[in-house]
């Protein structure tokens, strides 16, 4: 999906008002310095591409993020403010339902969500130069 035409300011508002709080809740009990941010993004469409990938694509050691509250709210925000997004995700969602696994919060998932927090922070500051 091409995130170029999304309403970035509305997505930013959704992140600040709800998604960020759900990410913090998920990470509660872990130190902010515990994980190094290894995933980065260069502009807002790129950030959303990376956020979508980390949130909804199962990875080795973490297959259960898509049903978390922050993930559902992320999906809703992208569907509401990115034209055509929800429809492109229909097939992906159906495939994901077939391979849904038992919900377990692993260290790998915590690391992945820590990466997501970094990507969202970057999304909110698009004019900052890449380090």
């Amino acid at each position: 999906y091409d995130f170029t035409n999304c309403d970035f300011e509305k997505i930013k508002a959704a992140y600040l008002s709800t998604i960020s709080k759900d990410l913090i809740t998920y990470m509660s009990g872990t130190k902010s310095t515990e994980f190094n941010n290894t995933v980065s993004c260069s502009n807002r469409p790129h950030c959303l591409t990376e956020i979508q990938s980390l949130t909804f694509n199962p990875t080795a050691g973490c297959a259960s993020l898509a049903k978390e509250m922050f993930a559902m709210k992320t999906k809703a925000a992208l569907a509401i403010w990115c034209p055509g997004y929800s429809e492109t995700q229909i097939n992906a969602t159906q495939a994901m339902k077939k391979r849904r696994k038992r919900k377990v919060t692993t260290n790998k998932c915590l690391e992945q969500v820590s990466q997501l927090q970094g990507l969202w922070r970057r999304f909110n500051r698009p004019l900052l130069k890449q380090q």
Epitope: A76, A79, P83, Y85, E87
Partner: antibody
Framework: EVQLVESGGGLVQPGGSLRLSCAAS????????MTWVRQAPGKGLEWVSS????????YYADSVKGRFTISRDNAKNSLSLQMNSLRAEDTAVYYC??????????????WGQGVLVTVSS | DIVMTQTPLSLSVTPGEPASISCRSS???????????LHWYLQKPGQSPQLLIY???YRASGVPDRFSGSGSDTDFTLKISRVEAEDVGVYYC?????????FGGGTKVEIK
């Protein structure tokens, strides 16, 4: 400029058929759900039918189910409403609108000028 | 089906004065993802309807900030802080939580 232009309205006898068309321009038509809404003379708005961007999901009001068929041609940026077995109560101005999918929460953010369909003998 | 009820049926307002329209749904319009699927439209005399507010409180593009939406669950309000002559017409609320999508009966706003 984002625009929706309807055509195909007119006078038809009860039991007859009519095909409404809507030409879209100024936006990537294939990214958006589309919806038909109608308004009987002097009355309020009534949702008729919605179709998602790739025609994967189609919805109808009970009052038109089995008689009306919504379709779209993304290559031609066009939306259609085939209306069969028309009744007097189908008399209304029919609006082509953008929305009805998840974008903007399903709200209808672009409206055509409307086309009048009159069912009378 | 979700029934949408608007009050009042009509409203006569002095220019510069505020106006308020209420919309009530027969069931909650809150989606499990946290958004509420309630929208407001204005149909000016002789024109097609236009989107004013979506998802309860988000102003559509080009809509003046004198229009605001609020509410939650089943009770919603559209406010015009200072009515202008160009605001006359019929205001409709709509729910898109589930099909059939349904509109309120409309509220006619006129200038005194």
């Amino acid at each position: 400029e984002v625009q929706l232009v309807e055509s195909g309205g007119g006078l038809v006898q009860p039991g007859g058929s009519l095909r409404l068309s809507c030409a879209a321009s100024g936006f990537t038509f294939s990214n958006y759900g589309m919806t038909w809404v109608r308004q009987a003379p002097g009355k309020g708005l009534e949702w008729v039918s919605s179709i998602t961007f790739a025609s994967s999901y189609i919805y109808y009001a009970d009052s038109v189910k089995g008689r009306f068929t919504i379709s779209r041609d993304n290559a031609k940026n066009s939306l259609s409403l085939q209306m069969n077995s028309l009744r007097a109560e189908d008399t209304a101005v029919y609006y082509c609108t953008r929305g009805g999918g998840a974008y903007y929460g399903g709200s209808l953010d672009v409206w055509g000028q409307g086309v009048l369909v009159t069912v009378s003998s | 089906d979700i029934v949408m009820t608007q009050t009042p049926l009509s409203l006569s307002v002095t220019p510069g004065e505020p106006a308020s329209i209420s919309c009530r749904s027969s069931q909650s319009l809150l989606h499990s993802y946290g958004y509420t699927y309630l929208h407001w439209y204005l149909q000016k005399p002789g024109q097609s309807p236009q989107l004013l507010i979506y998802l309860v409180s988000y102003r559509a593009s080009g809509v003046p900030d004198r229009f605001s939406g609020s509410g939650s669950d089943t009770d919603f309000t559209l406010k015009i802080s200072r009515v202008e002559a160009e605001d006359v017409g019929v205001y409709y609320c709509e729910q898109t939580l589930q099909t059939p999508y349904t509109f309120g009966g409309g509220t006619k706003v006129e200038i005194k």
